[in-house]
Every structure is written in structure tokens, then in C-alpha cells.
């Protein structure tokens, strides 16, 4: 039988290679049964995940899944880093795996490198 626990579908060690100045939507896919949980995003600072306050977020509904979206309008170099979503469900906190944004500043790159190049060339990235 299907579990009615809240589940957050962010893959472990996932990443997104993006460019400063572009818009980007970071999605947290959420599975729940009856009541949609409260979901928040945080950004990792070492081992601490700092809750993101006052950011533009939204929900998108698909047939079997809801998506809690963090909007970057536009992406800034300082958005580089790892993010995690958390759901508050029946007084318990369910945390997703973290996902990493690799941000390239197009001003410092003569041409846009590929996703794989960005993930493997940390000198292109902001920390």
C-alpha cells in the first residue's frame, strides 16, 4: 500500500548549472496524501541550513505531485551554493537532500560553458 508520509523528491548529490542574470526556478517536488504540508527552502552554510525569508516562492500542482518553487529573478553570483527544502508535517520536519546551484557569471566567461564543464571546473564558480 502507498505510504502516506510526505516525501520530497530531490535527488541526492543533484546539481543545476545556471548563469547569473538568467531567471531560474528551483523546484521541490512534494508528495502528500490529504493536507498539503508547509514547505520552506533554506541555503546551506556549512552544516547549518539558513531559512530563506522573504523570497518569491510559489506552488505548482501536477496530477500526482506538487512542486514548491523558489524563484531566482534573476540569478545572482551569490546564489551559488546548496539548497534544501523542508516540509512540516504532523509536527515533524521532513528534509530533502540538498541540491547545488553552480552559478557562472557570464561576464567572466567568454562563452557559456557546458553543464559538465561547469560542474567540473570550480574556478568558474562563485563560492
Amino acid at each position: 500500500k502507498e505510504s502516506c508520509d510526505v516525501q520530497l523528491y530531490i535527488k541526492r548529490q543533484s546539481y543545476h548549472s545556471i548563469f547569473a542574470g538568467d531567471p531560474f526556478k528551483l523546484e521541490c517536488p512534494v508528495k502528500y496524501c490529504a493536507h498539503r504540508p508547509q514547505v520552506t527552502w533554506c541555503k546551506l552554510n556549512g552544516t547549518t541550513c539558513v531559512k530563506l525569508e522573504g523570497r518569491h516562492t510559489s506552488w505548482k500542482q501536477e496530477k500526482n505531485l506538487s512542486f514548491f518553487i523558489l524563484h531566482f529573478e534573476p540569478v545572482l553570483p551569490s546564489d551559488n551554493g546548496s539548497y534544501r527544502c523542508s516540509a512540516n508535517f504532523l509536527s515533524a520536519i521532513i528534509e530533502s537532500h540538498s541540491t547545488t546551484l553552480y552559478v557562472t557569471d557570464v561576464k567572466s566567461a567568454s562563452e557559456r560553458p557546458s553543464k559538465d564543464e561547469m560542474a567540473s571546473r570550480p574556478w568558474l564558480l562563485y563560492s
Epitope: L8, Y9, R12, S14, S17, L44, T47, H97, S98, D116
Partner: antibody, heavy 119, light 112 residues
């Protein structure tokens, strides 16, 4: 029934290229990471790299970077390993494996395909 | 890269007896999410590997409960409490905490 079936192996000359396929069924490939491993005759296992079929992102062991390309077609549930500039030491059984990406719920391996690099 | 070292390289154990295989990593495998991504694979002669244990101690579905995994940080153990004939295989530990993922050299388990 869950299946991963590798194909495309065989005898290939040094310096040539080869594309291996991994046809999957019985699960949603986009919920997983597809890994490629290899095992030289009588030796241990070695991780080549992995692909996220949901977005195409890849990671490789350094020694394969630039010589191996892992890709996947999520709509067909097939993954690929392209190997270029093959050397005799690339002779091995190549395995694909699919590991669930969210909660480690499964890790399925294919039966492997033998690649022999020889002139 | 993380170096994974298994001991012993080979092991002969009588049927019904306990078999213990050790695996040591050159760095802690504790991830920042608090989990340890250490796996054990079983490869029977002429077959492809099969996932046996993941997250140090979780048994894959269908794996008999005579198999168990333990350990933390850098030191891990696979134990077969009562060896059966079908357990004849090579066992590998591998880590997927740190890139690149790496394997132990394997331990060949034979029946005494």
C-alpha cells in the same frame, strides 16, 4: 519485472570508439541515477560515472573524463556509454546499474556486456 | 580519491559458521546529511553484482537476514551469521558519499 540489459559489446580495435546501450524496464528511469561500472577480467569493480536521466547531468571518474560520455533518453528508458580512443586495457565487462536517487530504495544491476579491445 | 581497503582478501569458512569481512575507508564516509553511504555487493561466480546492503546496515529486499552490516565513519563490517553454500561469492564494499565513487578490492568467500 525490473530489467537492465546492456548491449553493444564485442571486439573492437585500439583507437576506435564504441557505444554501449542499457535498456531498462520495470521502473521510471527518471527517478534514478544510471551508473556505468566496469570489471577487467579477473579484477575488481571500477566506477566509470553516472547520469541523471531527469536532466542529463553527469559525473565521471577523472580517468574517464573526456574519453567517456554517459547519456540517457528518459522517454525511451535507455542509457548509453560512449567510449572513445579505446585501449587494450579497456577490455572489461561493462555493467550499467540503476540506483533510486531519492531514498536509496533500490539498486539494480544489468548482466553486463564484454568489450574486448584488441588488434 | 577515497581508498577502500577490504580484509581479508579471501576467507574460507565452514557451512553454518560465521563469516566476517572488514572494509576500511581512507576518509570518513559520513555525509553532511548525517547518513553514511557505504554499500556491500555480492558477486557470485559468472554473475553480475547484486546490491546486498546499503546505508551501512540496511538489507536490500529479498536478502536473507543472516547478512548484516555495521560500522561508522571509516570502519565497516559485513557479517554472515551462518554461512550457506549459496553464499560462495566475492563481496565488495563501495562508497558513494564522495566523488569519485570507489570500491574495495573484493573479498573471495569460499567454503571450507
Amino acid at each position: 519485472e525490473v530489467q537492465l540489459v546492456e548491449s553493444g559489446g564485442g571486439l573492437v580495435q585500439p583507437g576506435r570508439s564504441l557505444r554501449l546501450s542499457c535498456t531498462t524496464s520495470g521502473f521510471n528511469i527518471k527517478d534514478t541515477y544510471i551508473h556505468w561500472f566496469r570489471q577487467a577480467p579477473g579484477k575488481g569493480l571500477e566506477w566509470v560515472g553516472r547520469n541523471d536521466p531527469a536532466n542529463g547531468n553527469t559525473k565521471y571518474t577523472a580517468s574517464f573524463k573526456g574519453r567517456a560520455t554517459i547519456s540517457a533518453d528518459g522517454s525511451k528508458s535507455i542509457a548509453y556509454l560512449q567510449m572513445n580512443s579505446l585501449k587494450t586495457e579497456d577490455t572489461a565487462v561493462y555493467y550499467c546499474a540503476s540506483y533510486e536517487g531519492y531514498y536509496e530504495r533500490f539498486g539494480y544491476w544489468g548482466q553486463g556486456t564484454l568489450v574486448t579491445v584488441s588488434s | 580519491d577515497i581508498v577502500m581497503t577490504q580484509s581479508p582478501d579471501s576467507l574460507a569458512v565452514s557451512l553454518g559458521e560465521r563469516a566476517t569481512i572488514n572494509c576500511k575507508s581512507s576518509q570518513s564516509l559520513l555525509d553532511r546529511d548525517g547518513k553514511t553511504y557505504l554499500n556491500w555487493l555480492q558477486q557470485k561466480p559468472g554473475q553480475s553484482p547484486k546490491r546486498l546492503i546499503y546505508l551501512v546496515s540496511k538489507l536490500d529486499s529479498g536478502v536473507p537476514d543472516r547478512f548484516s552490516g555495521s560500522g561508522s565513519g571509516t570502519d565497516f563490517t559485513l557479517t554472515i551469521s551462518s554461512l550457506q553454500a549459496e553464499d560462495l561469492a566475492v563481496y565488495y564494499c563501495w562508497q558513494d558519499t564522495h566523488f569519485p565513487y570507489t570500491f574495495g578490492q573484493g573479498t573471495k568467500l569460499e567454503i571450507k
